[in-house]
Structures are given as structure tokens and as C-alpha cells.
């Protein structure tokens, strides 16, 4: 029986050009984590295997850094990075746990966000 739960950073926003940390945490289970996959939609971003360490997909190598911990740091954000991210925990003996994070990358600076919502 799978008793564990995944806590994530939930819905987060960040500024274009900036960076963000995607974090998931598996709790309420004694299952051994053998591997964590990070995916964006159906695209593999990174893998962290307990034995083999980190692998960052070549197409993301310049903008994705492993950690902290089992998390993932996205750098040089663009508006195209907006969307769903999934942390997939492979555990033994429980099986697979999946967490979801929604990232919104905002155009430009806080000052400009303010301007966007000004009442005429």
C-alpha cells in the first residue's frame, strides 16, 4: 500500500531572465527512493538516481542545474518555460509517486507588472 505523499512548491512565479528552484519532498513513507525524474510536460529535464547520480538532458544542460538536494534549479528563464513540471519519485517497494508544480514566468520587472495593472 502506498502511504507516502509528495509535497511540492505548488504554483510559483518567477521573472523572465531569472532563476527558480523546483522542489518536491516525499514524506509519510519508509520506502527507499531509487530515482527521481524531473519532467516538463512529456519532456525529460533531469534524472537523479541514487546510484548513478545526476543526468541533465543535453538540450537543457545550459539552463538546468542539479539540486539543491533532489530539487532542480532552472536558470535564464523565458516565457516558454511557463507550464507544468513533474517530479516523479521511483521508490521501493511502494512504486511511483508524482508531484506537480506550475511555473509562470512573468515578462520583465515588478515595476512593469505594476504598470500593467494600473487603473486608467
Amino acid at each position: 500500500m502506498m502511504t507516502g505523499t509528495i509535497e511540492t512548491t505548488g504554483n510559483i512565479s518567477a521573472e523572465k531572465g531569472g532563476s527558480i528552484i523546483l522542489q518536491c519532498h516525499l514524506s509519510s513513507t519508509t520506502a527507499q527512493v531509487t530515482q527521481v525524474n524531473w519532467e516538463q510536460q512529456d519532456q525529460l529535464l533531469a534524472i537523479c538516481n541514487a546510484d548513478l547520480g545526476w543526468h541533465i538532458s543535453p538540450s537543457f544542460k545550459d539552463r538546468v542545474a542539479p539540486g539543491p538536494g533532489l530539487g532542480l534549479t532552472l536558470q535564464s528563464l523565458t516565457v516558454n518555460d511557463t507550464g507544468e513540471y513533474f517530479c516523479i519519485y521511483h521508490t521501493y517497494p511502494d512504486g511511483t509517486y508524482t508531484g506537480r508544480i506550475f511555473l509562470e514566468v512573468l515578462e520583465s520587472s515588478v515595476a512593469e507588472h505594476g504598470a500593467r495593472f494600473q487603473i486608467p
Epitope: T34, Q35, N49, D51, L52, G53, H90, Y92
Partner: antibody, heavy 119, light 110 residues
Framework: EVQLLESGGGLVQPGGSLRLSCATS????????VSWVRQAPGKGLEWVST???????????YYADSVKGRFTISRDNSENTLYLQMNSLRAEDTAVYYC?????????WGQGTTVTVSS | QSVLTQPPSASGTPGQRVTISCSAS????????FYWYQQLPGTAPKLLIY???QRPSGVPDRFSGSKSGTSVSLAISGLQSEDEADYYC???????????FGGGTKLTVL
């Protein structure tokens, strides 16, 4: 260019010992996973041992059950060289021994060194 | 006996598409990543496919890897005489903490 060069193979009697070396160039051996894989004459590939990078799991080592307790993988970071100390050798250890670099797939291999265990 | 089963031999004619299978028990396929190696006669193995379907730089796109159900496979399209070699599938076993290789498939180009 990344290269691996094995040496140290030869003819040894059952129960004897040999130390294989894998000299590497083009990368820092301590920062990468390096494995030993063997191939008995006319047979397929068999994984022997892996040394992980020092920045993951403190350079933990892994062994196939068939060699556990008899073989020891080690590294000399200053020489950028990997070793396989083989003790209590058996006839079934006769094979070409390759060292190979990589964690998510072994992407660079040496040319191999031949170990023959026979009386 | 390996937990990965490959046909001992396969063959095809130049220009043909050939598929080499590698089957395992259910518990291995779904959550594992698979790798394919090519070993030309008298040479060391070469990584052909990693993480199920990714090609290292320098590997022609004639080679492709896929995974479905209880089997993974390597497809070679536009078969060439220089593709005659032994092909091995492999995966890292998280419980044994080691690499597991299939028995290998000898590909003959007729």
C-alpha cells in the same frame, strides 16, 4: 580527446592474483563513473565493477556477485588511473577486461586487456 | 542466465530495416532506462543508445531505440554492411546496484 588504456593482463594460475590498470586521459577520473566489464572468449558482455564519482555517494564502489570479495576496484586520482585488483582467480575469470567511462551509459571504452586463468 | 533476453541472431539485407528485441520481466521495463551497445568484430563495445531512445553525438539517426510493454527494441533502418556486429541491451539494476547485460544479438548483413 577522452581515452582509456588498459594494461596488466596476462596468464595466471588458478588462485593467483593480477592487478589491471586503466590509464585515462582527457577527463578527471575522480569526477566520473568508471567501470570494468569483461567478455569471456566467444561470450557476451558481463559487468564486473563500477567506481562512482567522488562528488556522488563519496565515490562508492559496486561489484557483481561473481567477483564480490575477490576483486577490488580503486583509483589513483593523482595518476588519473583506475585499478582492478583480482585475487583468488578462477578459470571462469578468463576474459578480455575493458574499462569504460560513464554513468548513464558507458560512452567511452578502452581496447581491453586479456586475462587467462589456467594451470 | 540474464534477466534480459535477446534473440541470438538477426539478419537483413542492405537497405532493409531490422529490429532487435530485448525482453524482460514487467518489473524491469517500466521504471528502468535501457541502453544499447554495438560491438564490431574484434573491437570494444560502443554506446549506441542511452536512456531508452537517446543517441550520443556521432551515432547515425538510422539507429533508434524504443520501449513498450515488456520489451525494448533497437531498430536499424537503411541497413549497411558495416552494421554487421553484436548488439547488447543493458540497464542499471537499482537493487543489485550494477549493470545487467542481455546475452547479445549477432546481426548479419546478407
Amino acid at each position: 580527446e577522452v581515452q582509456l588504456l588498459e594494461s596488466g593482463g596476462g596468464l595466471v594460475q588458478p588462485g593467483g592474483s593480477l592487478r589491471l590498470s586503466c590509464a585515462t586521459s582527457g577527463f578527471t577520473v575522480s569526477d566520473h563513473y568508471v567501470s570494468w566489464v569483461r567478455q569471456a572468449p566467444g561470450k557476451g558482455l558481463e559487468w564486473v565493477s563500477t567506481s562512482s564519482s567522488t562528488n556522488w555517494n563519496d565515490g562508492r564502489t559496486y561489484y557483481a556477485d561473481s567477483v564480490k570479495g575477490r576483486f577490488t576496484i580503486s583509483r589513483d586520482n593523482s595518476e588519473n588511473t583506475l585499478y582492478l585488483q583480482m585475487n583468488s582467480l578462477r578459470a571462469e575469470d578468463t576474459a578480455v577486461y575493458y574499462c569504460a567511462k560513464g554513468s548513464y551509459g558507458m560512452d567511452v571504452w578502452g581496447q581491453g586487456t586479456t586475462v587467462t586463468v589456467s594451470s | 542466465q540474464s534477466v534480459l533476453t535477446q534473440p541470438p541472431s538477426a539478419s537483413g539485407t542492405p537497405g532493409q530495416r531490422v529490429t532487435i528485441s530485448c525482453s524482460a520481466s514487467n518489473s524491469y521495463i517500466g521504471t528502468k532506462y535501457f541502453y544499447w551497445y554495438q560491438q564490431l568484430p574484434g573491437t570494444a563495445p560502443k554506446l549506441l543508445i542511452y536512456l531508452d531512445s537517446q543517441r550520443p553525438s556521432g551515432v547515425p539517426d538510422r539507429f533508434s531505440g524504443s520501449k513498450s510493454g515488456t520489451s525494448v527494441s533497437l531498430a536499424i533502418s537503411g541497413l549497411q554492411s558495416e552494421d554487421e556486429a553484436d548488439y547488447y541491451c543493458a540497464f542499471w539494476d537499482d537493487h543489485l546496484h550494477g549493470w545487467v547485460f542481455g546475452g547479445g544479438t549477432k546481426l548479419t548483413v546478407l
